[in-house]
């Protein structure tokens, strides 16, 4: 349904508040270094223009595409060349190349200061003084740090952020009310950002087919009572939504997401019995709720898969007639029967099935060739099961911090060229799989763990892509989306790595460590651990553990000392000497 003015269409569909918020998110995700005030000015100009188009869709420039309008606006920024360097060259291009150029310059790790949380009273005053600016600033700060954050979901986070301040700034104990809510939003926000980053990487690096396969598997697990045609329709619509958001088309994305939620709720009888509560909520909550809804119960008496996909004489005929539809049906049927499998495992099984049919349907006796195809699935299923069992046992034995340390050592030995901050961040997140998933019963462990690990390893992949330093990381990240985790799991110690020169400065600590939060102190210790492994990749687990115990004792001793700085200087020398001796540096 073509509209004379796309900008007027979206303004009317979304309403002024959401329109402005989404344009702010879009601009902040593109120009991540621009000051808040500059973005607000640009958004206001776009909004005023949109209003003129609502009043008269035939007005000048109202027929231009959103990319043209937004790109032209971004290219008016005076300091583009000084602030962004070669990104300014994008402005010399025409659409759609200009937008592609902006997308390629999105920075997953922008050089921005850490967000420091002000005192509660300061925040409440700012909230009361100018609620609108306060909330816009939240959108801006999150969007510029997370340039692929799912925009309509960020509106939902902002709504919760506002609700937290509205409630807690009136509470007797403001801090007790507000801080846990802000912590929860921060943690959920980081998780949401990382999940969306994987969706965008899937679309951008592996194409629409890869994303659709992921969506078929996930939606079939979630809606096992829905017909294949219904799941296919949802997959098509969901793919459009995420393609738009990942492509910077945030207005279209939010609009289409709302339409999809509406469709799902109008057709819940043929989709899932679990949607009732979600569908009673307002739009933003509704969409979020649907995205997180629990798996519906599997239909009773589902027939064996073998009949249609192995035993039938028409397997090769059905495959040849419409390969992707047949494979989609296989994936749908397998996934709806296996909510206990990770999505990536289901995709590996589908790939194995596809490879087998490609080979066998060209053979003299196809049926004889593919008759044992399901036997090929067994090792693929057992590999993640065994890995999760082993790692959950290790997690239960060590606890989260020491489990993270074990992973830090493991991954630093695999890919020692990767920067220390990236190794620390990724290994800490990998380690969180323990508390997140090991508490679940067997039937929920694999989908929880392996699909979470896919999200975390994608963080490693996108951070590494910005400054590639390891061929092994590049190989695991680019060869196969669904085999990334097995690829990293299979890496052994990198024997080609030349150990880093020992630098005592890396292991010199000061009294400022004493005022850090427990989390920040852990990060300092884990940074030191990575550096130790980079200096001595052949260090044993026992050696590293002993040195880290020394380090913990050193920090505790000096933080209790009267003259902390002197303690850090004198004891630090002893610690470095002992560590060098222990590791033979």
């Amino acid at each position: 349904d073509a509209h004379k003015s796309e900008v007027a269409h979206r303004f009317k569909d979304l309403g002024e508040e959401n329109f402005k918020a989404l344009v702010l998110i879009a601009f902040a995700q593109y120009l991540q270094q621009c000051p808040f005030e500059d973005h607000v000015k640009l958004v206001n100009e776009v909004t005023e223009f949109a209003k003129t188009c609502v009043a008269d869709e035939s007005a000048e420039n109202c027929d231009k595409s959103l990319h043209t309008l937004f790109g032209d606006k971004l290219c008016t920024v005076a300091t583009l060349r000084e602030t962004y360097g070669e990104m300014a060259d994008c402005c010399a291009k025409q659409e759609p190349e200009r937008n592609e150029c902006f997308l390629q310059h999105k920075d997953d790790n922008p050089n921005l200061p850490r967000l420091v949380r002000p005192e509660v009273d300061v925040m409440c005053t700012a909230f009361h003084d100018n609620e609108e600016t306060f909330l816009k600033k939240y959108l801006y700060e999150i969007a510029r740090r997370h340039p692929y954050f799912y925009a309509p979901e960020l509106l939902f986070f902002a709504k919760r952020y506002k609700a937290a301040f509205t409630e807690c700034c009136q509470a007797a104990d403001k801090a007790a009310c507000l801080l846990p809510k802000l912590d929860e939003l921060r943690d959920e926000g980081k998780a949401s950002s990382a999940k969306q980053r994987l969706k965008c990487a899937s679309l951008q690096k592996f194409g629409e087919r890869a994303f659709k396969a992921w969506a078929v598997a996930r939606l079939s697990q979630r809606f096992p009572k829905a017909e294949f045609a219904e799941v296919s329709k949802l997959v098509t619509d969901l793919t459009k939504v995420h393609t738009e958001c990942c492509h910077g088309d945030l207005l279209e994305c939010a609009d289409d997401r709302a339409d999809l939620a509406k469709y799902i709720c109008e057709n819940q009888d043929s989709i899932s019995s679990k949607l009732k509560e979600c569908c009673e909520k307002p739009l933003l909550e509704k969409s979020h709720c649907i995205a997180e809804v629990e798996n519906d119960e599997m239909p009773a008496d589902l027939p064996s898969l073998a009949a249609d996909f192995v035993e039938s004489k028409d397997v090769c005929k059905n495959y040849a007639e419409a390969k992707d539809v047949f494979l989609g049906m296989f994936l749908y049927e397998y996934a709806r029967r296996h909510p206990d499998y990770s999505v990536v495992l289901l995709l590996r099984l589908a790939k194995t099935y596809e490879t087998t049919l490609e080979k066998c349907c060209a053979a003299a006796d196809p049926h004889e060739c593919y008759a044992k195809v399901f036997d090929r699935f067994k090792p693929l299923v057992e590999e993640p099961q065994n890995l999760i069992k082993q790692n959950c046992e290790l997690f239960e034995q060590l606890g989260e911090y020491k489990f993270q340390n074990a992973l830090l050592v493991r991954y630093t030995k695999k890919v020692p060229q990767v920067s220390t901050p990236t190794l620390v961040e990724v290994s800490r997140n990998l380690g969180k799989v323990g508390s997140k998933c090991c508490k679940h019963p067997e039937a929920k462990r694999m989908p929880c763990a392996e699909d979470y690990l896919s999200v975390v390893l994608n963080q490693l992949c996108v951070l590494h892509e910005k400054t590639p330093v390891s061929d092994r990381v590049t190989k695991c990240c680019t060869e196969s989306l669904v085999n990334r985790r097995p690829c990293f799991s299979a890496l052994e110690v990198d024997e080609t790595y030349v150990p880093k020169e020992f630098n005592a400065e890396t292991f010199t600590f000061h009294a400022d460590i004493c005022t850090l939060s427990e989390k920040e102190r852990q990060i300092k210790k884990q940074t030191a651990l990575v550096e130790l492994v980079k200096h001595k990749p052949k260090a044993t687990k026992e050696q590293l553990k002993a040195v880290m115990d020394d380090f913990a004792a050193f920090v505790e001793k000096c933080c209790k000392a009267d003259d902390k700085e002197t303690c850090f200087a004198e004891e630090g020398k002893k610690l470095v000497a002992a560590s060098q001796a222990a590791l033979g540096l």
Epitope: D550, A553, E556, K557, A578
Partner: nanobody, 123 residues
Framework: HVQLVESGGGLAQAGGSLRLSCAAS????????MGWFRQAPGMEREFVAI???????TYADSVEGRFTVSRDIAKNTVYLEMNSLKPEDTAVYSC?????????????????WGQGTQVTVSS
């Protein structure tokens, strides 16, 4: 001069327990680690467990979860609680005091050694 005197060794059944004690005298150990090494017949001396002045402990993998090291700084005494003993724990156990709080899991990090006490675990 500094003396480290161990006690509590002896014969134990596999799966049984023993508690070793070590009394230090002639010096101050409040700023350095103390702990235990052991040497089985025909084997090299090996690290067992240490405790630093802060209370931070480190154990050899072979004894982790079975042995517990503790100390009483006021009494200049260190202990080793040994549970779920195995025949391979049979050795002479020596009490040690470190040069500093760090590196005490290596012989080069040790300043003082006790004479040792025999522990024999029968199957």
């Amino acid at each position: 001069h500094v003396q480290l005197v161990e006690s509590g060794g002896g014969l134990a059944q596999a799966g049984g327990s023993l508690r070793l004690s070590c009394a230090a005298s002639g010096g101050t150990f409040s700023n350095s680690c103390m702990g235990w090494f052991r040497q089985a017949p025909g084997m090299e001396r090996e690290f067992v467990a240490i405790i630093r002045s802060t209370g931070h402990t480190t154990y050899a993998d072979s004894v982790e979860g079975r042995f517990t090291v503790s100390r009483d700084i006021a009494k200049n005494t260190v202990y080793l609680e040994m549970n779920s003993l195995k025949p391979e724990d049979t050795a002479v156990y020596s009490c040690v005091a470190g040069v500093s709080d760090y590196g005490c899991y290596r012989t080069s990090g040790i300043k003082y050694w006790g004479q040792g006490t025999q522990v024999t675990v029968s199957s």
